[in-house]
Interface confidence: low
């Protein structure tokens, strides 16, 4: 069953390569158990970048070596990106799934496109 | 009269707050001077940036304290705009006018966003 | 030093026209870069644009003249003229002819009056 | 047409001292003005253009400021041949259309 997603359109990565952004969902009842999945889509392609299950009320969880991080509050997810460089610029999408209990529910965001700029190296200090 | 000018939609400024693109504007006619201004759009606020008149054919020229620089060729006009901060972040509009022979032609784009991201300090060399 | 010379008579009768040359030298009336104007001042009175002319393109004149006058330039000939027709009184003034370089007039002839008078 | 208003229409004043004077255009003309000056018998000169920029040959002296609607020339202290009239003129939009001039005479 689809379920609406909301995202921002645009994100700036700071000159550490770290994005935040906020994945909203319309949640039609009471789950328990979501899963977040970050998508990429550059040039057709859509990669999977990240994802997490949590329980509700509960930190999300990414493997030791995601290059996401999260916070959930109610309906909306907290999510961080890092490791970014101006390469990854794209579009991130984000997809909820309410895992349980039934029935399933899925929605996905339009996309926030993330703007990653490569920072000057800091001059040698000799 | 009308006359149709494109831009892009999105331009990063890079780490050294240097953004650059291209205006390009559809000539209903063969003109010999033509002025651009580059207008910044931003909390509904409209203000100038810089502007150049320039004969066809040979460079721009913006005053000495410009944060504008430019070259033309043909129907398009290169603009980097330099001394950007992330508070610079806005709309930035291309406005062409052709300026002689009559008769005059005015067009304006629909805005380039620029996005500018504030480097990190590089660390104190001890 | 580019030097801007008028020429033509220095009296026209009403309802006649006016004609005026103006010779450029030490400067091409075919650069790119510059455009050749008419400027006029009558006895006691402030600056008023007549026109302006590209060699390339079409002259460019101030709405209130533009029924009466004709300006053109001729490159092989290095000059460029004006032409008034149907003058009035209201029309004697000092005639300047200029380069204009974009936005401002950056040389002027010595200027040339023209009175109308029967 | 766009208009250009000059003030004062006269100043007198005594060499050595500090001028100012303005030009209000009835619509915005971003920085598209230029300023003249004008001896008895002569043609005029361009002393200021793109509101601000000194043209070749013109003493220090000389200065315009603004942007928009209002102008200003600035002569930091008068000169003997510095009396005469100066006029503004816009070349932001059609026509060209000149102020009506200020006479600076000795005091």
């Known amino acids: 069953k689809a379920m609406h997603v909301a995202q921002p359109a645009v994100v700036l990565a700071n000159s550490r390569g770290i994005a935040s952004f906020v994945c909203e969902y319309a949640s039609p009842g009471k789950a328990t158990e979501v899963r977040v999945t970050v998508l990429r889509q550059a040039d057709s392609q859509v990669t999977e970048v990240c994802a997490a299950t949590y329980m509700m009320g509960n930190e999300l969880t990414f493997l030791d070596d995601s290059i996401c991080t999260g916070t959930s509050s109610g309906n909306q997810v907290n999510l961080t990106i890092q490791g970014l460089r101006a390469m990854d610029t794209g579009l991130y999408i984000c997809k909820v799934e309410l895992m349980y209990p039934p029935p399933y529910y899925m929605g996905i965001g339009n996309g926030t496109q993330i703007y990653v700029i490569d920072p000057e190296p800091c001059p040698d200090s000799d | 009269k009308a006359m149709h000018v494109a831009q892009p939609a999105v331009v990063l400024a890079n780490s050294r707050g240097i953004a650059s693109f291209v205006c390009e504007y559809a000539s209903p006619g063969k003109a010999t001077e033509v002025r651009v201004t580059v207008l910044r759009q931003a909390d509904s606020q409209v203000t100038e940036v810089c502007a150049a008149t320039y004969m066809m054919g040979n460079e721009l020229t913006f005053l000495d304290d410009s944060i504008c620089t430019g070259t033309s060729s043909g129907n398009q006009v290169n603009l980097t705009i330099q001394g950007l901060r992330a508070m610079d972040t806005g709309l930035y509009i291309c406005k062409v006018e052709l300026m002689y022979p009559p008769p005059y032609y005015m067009g304006i784009g629909n805005g380039t966003q620029i996005y500018v991201i504030d480097p990190e300090p590089c660390p104190d060399s001890d | 030093q580019l030097q801007l010379q008028e020429s033509g008579p220095g009296l026209v009768k009403p309802s006649e026209t006016l004609s005026l040359t103006c010779i450029v030298s030490?400067?091409?009336?075919?650069?790119?870069?510059?455009?050749w104007g008419w400027i006029r001042q009558p006895p006691g009175k402030g600056l008023e644009w007549i026109g302006t002319?590209?060699?390339?393109?079409?002259?460019y004149y101030d709405p209130s003249l533009k029924s009466r006058v004709t300006i053109s330039v001729d490159t092989s000939k290095n000059h460029f003229s004006l032409k008034l027709n149907s003058v009035t009184a209201a029309d004697t003034a000092v005639y300047y002819c200029?380069?204009?370089?974009?936005?401002?007039?950056?040389?002027w002839g010595q200027g040339t009056l023209v009175t109308v008078s029967s | 047409e766009i208009v250009l208003t000059q003030s004062p229409a006269t100043l007198s004043l005594s060499p050595g001292e500090r001028v100012t004077l303005s030009c209000r255009a009835s619509?915005?003309?971003?920085?598209?003005l230029a300023w003249y000056q004008q001896k008895p018998g002569q043609a005029p000169r361009v002393l200021i253009y793109d509101a601000s920029n000194r043209a070749t040959d013109i003493p220090a002296r000389f200065s315009g400021s603004g942007s928009g609607t209002d102008f200003t020339l600035t002569i930091s202290s008068l000169e003997p041949e510095d009396f005469a009239v100066y006029y503004c003129?816009?070349?932001?939009?059609?026509?060209?259309?000149f102020g009506q001039g200020t006479r600076l005479e000795i005091k």
């Open positions: 030490g400067g091409s009336t075919s650069s790119n870069t510059y455009y």
């Open positions: 619509q915005s003309i971003s920085r598209y």
């Open positions: 003129q816009q070349r932001s939009n059609w026509p060209i259309t």
């Open positions: 200029t380069r204009q370089y974009i936005n401002f007039f950056d040389f």
């Open positions: 002319i590209h060699y390339s393109g079409n002259p």
